[in-house]
């Protein structure tokens, strides 16, 4: 019973985590304009992995995709890759874990097969979570570096009269979503691995019982099941969350256009 609960909980936690990873990857607010110690601007800038957006005081929000692939920073490409790998692994892990759930009966699937599938999905969830955490951390590190660099050159004077204020960026909501989601996926994966141990049938040291019948001596010894790992690796990426991070005023809809001051 405890094994089933651990496995089920691990699945649910991983499902929430992967949904969060997908959400974070789609969100536009990976980095947001730093408003602290900055002149109050009538525009607010924020950036995602796929596009950058500007929200004006007027409520109008304009987003522009990064239509270049080669012109983008290598770090951004690396973060994108890590997040996508995390999503793909997580999606495969979810698919595998569905069939591995003890509460779901699929034909005459043996417990050892379910144990192996649970372990496989657990490992996939762990790697998926680590990918997400790594991706978000790399991006955060990039932000911190750029933040202090732009702080050092905050004001670039032009003849002492004209000043150009550099826009500094700080952590956006997507980073926190990503960290939490990655952590949940990781925890879910660990729970699946723990559940796997409980699912695997143990070698029981029963004494061999001899049955004597009409001169024939046949010994029946309880043996281990043959571990079957022949489950299909269905890589169909099932989207759990398709929301992206639509800021309240990205599309000029009312009344949410001005849900800020």
């Amino acid at each position: 019973m405890a094994v089933t609960a651990c496995q089920g909980l691990g699945f649910v936690v991983s499902l929430i985590g992967i949904a969060g990873i997908i959400a974070a990857t789609c969100m536009d607010q990976w980095s947001t304009q730093d408003l602290y110690n900055n002149p109050v601007t009538a525009v607010f800038n924020y950036q995602g992995l796929w596009r950058s957006c500007v929200r004006e005081s007027s409520g109008f929000t304009e987003c522009r995709g990064y239509f270049t692939l080669l012109g983008l920073p290598a770090m951004l490409q690396a973060v994108r890759a890590l997040m996508i790998v995390g999503i793909v692994l997580g999606a495969i892990g979810l698919l595998v874990s569905i069939f591995a759930l003890k509460c779901i009966r699929i034909g005459s699937m043996e417990d050892s097969a379910k144990a192996n599938m649970t372990l496989t999905s657990g490992i996939m969830f762990i790697v998926s979570g680590l990918c997400a955490i790594a991706g978000v951390s790399v991006f955060a590190n990039m932000l911190v570096t750029n933040f202090w660099m732009s702080t050092a050159n905050m004001y670039t004077g032009m003849g002492g009269m004209v000043q150009t204020v550099q826009t500094r960026y700080t952590f956006g909501a997507a980073l926190f979503v990503g960290w939490v989601a990655g952590g949940l996926t990781l925890i879910g994966g660990v729970m699946m691995c723990i559940a796997c141990r409980g699912l695997a049938p143990e070698e029981t040291n029963y004494k061999a019982v001899s049955y004597h019948a009409s001169g024939h001596s046949v010994a029946y010894k309880p043996g281990g099941f043959k571990a079957s790992t022949g489950f299909g690796s269905n890589t169909k990426n099932k989207k759990i969350y398709d929301g992206g991070a639509r800021t309240e005023d990205e599309v000029q809809s009312y009344p949410s256009k001005h849900d800020y001051v």
Epitope: Q33, P39, V40, T41, A42, V43, N45, Q47, S52, C53, V54, E56, S57, S58, G59, F60, E62, R64, V162, Q163, T164, V165, T167, Q252, Y254, P255, S256, K257, H258, D259, Y260, V261
Partner: antibody, heavy 118, light 113 residues
Amino acid sequence: EVQLQQSGPELVKPGASVKMSCKSSGYTFTGFLMHWVKQKPGQGLEWIGYINPYNDGTKYSEKFKGKATLTSDKSSSTAYMELSSLTSDDSAVYYCGRLDYGNAMDYWGQGTSVTVSS
Amino acid sequence: DIVMTQSPSSLTVTAGEKVTMRCRSTQSLFNSGNQRNYLTWYQQKPGQPPKLLIYWASTRESGVPDRFTGSGSGTDFTLTISSVQAEDLAVYYCQNAYYYPLTFGVGTKLERK
């Protein structure tokens, strides 16, 4: 058609207060910030502040903090500006303007003339 | 606060003439996020409220004749009227639309010669 209709001219005594209105029509009132601008006779334009009619959030120019108070009434699609402790320096035409693309005021009221005189 | 400096303060023109007025800000009004300059131009005739001409430094408001052209980037901006008409005689204001408080230039007055 978008229209901003401001209240009529005011003649007030020094030290008194005045409250002027700006009634909106032809658009969703809560969807746009309403800005207020001061213009002294024969002079330039001076930004006072804005109100967000959706949540009544306000932002003021430092110069007008304590002088101007911006409010709005969703039910009548009207923005208000109250000026307190009036002096001769407050004699001016006050405009309301709707903020749109590019943080530009695309529609303006006809202006409310305030004369402070004893 | 951002200071907007307009020059010249007045211009004497004849109909059909090409007119250029300048506006300079003490800080850049360019936003790298959307590659736009947050400078606005208004026209004000006596006894009337200001009328929006150009926003984002170069985008003409709908209904504004195409003889009005806005240009410039960063801190230096220009409003050009390719062929001045009698109805263009007014005061032209530039406005910082990037930083609060929003600030206006003192204006350029267009007068008949």
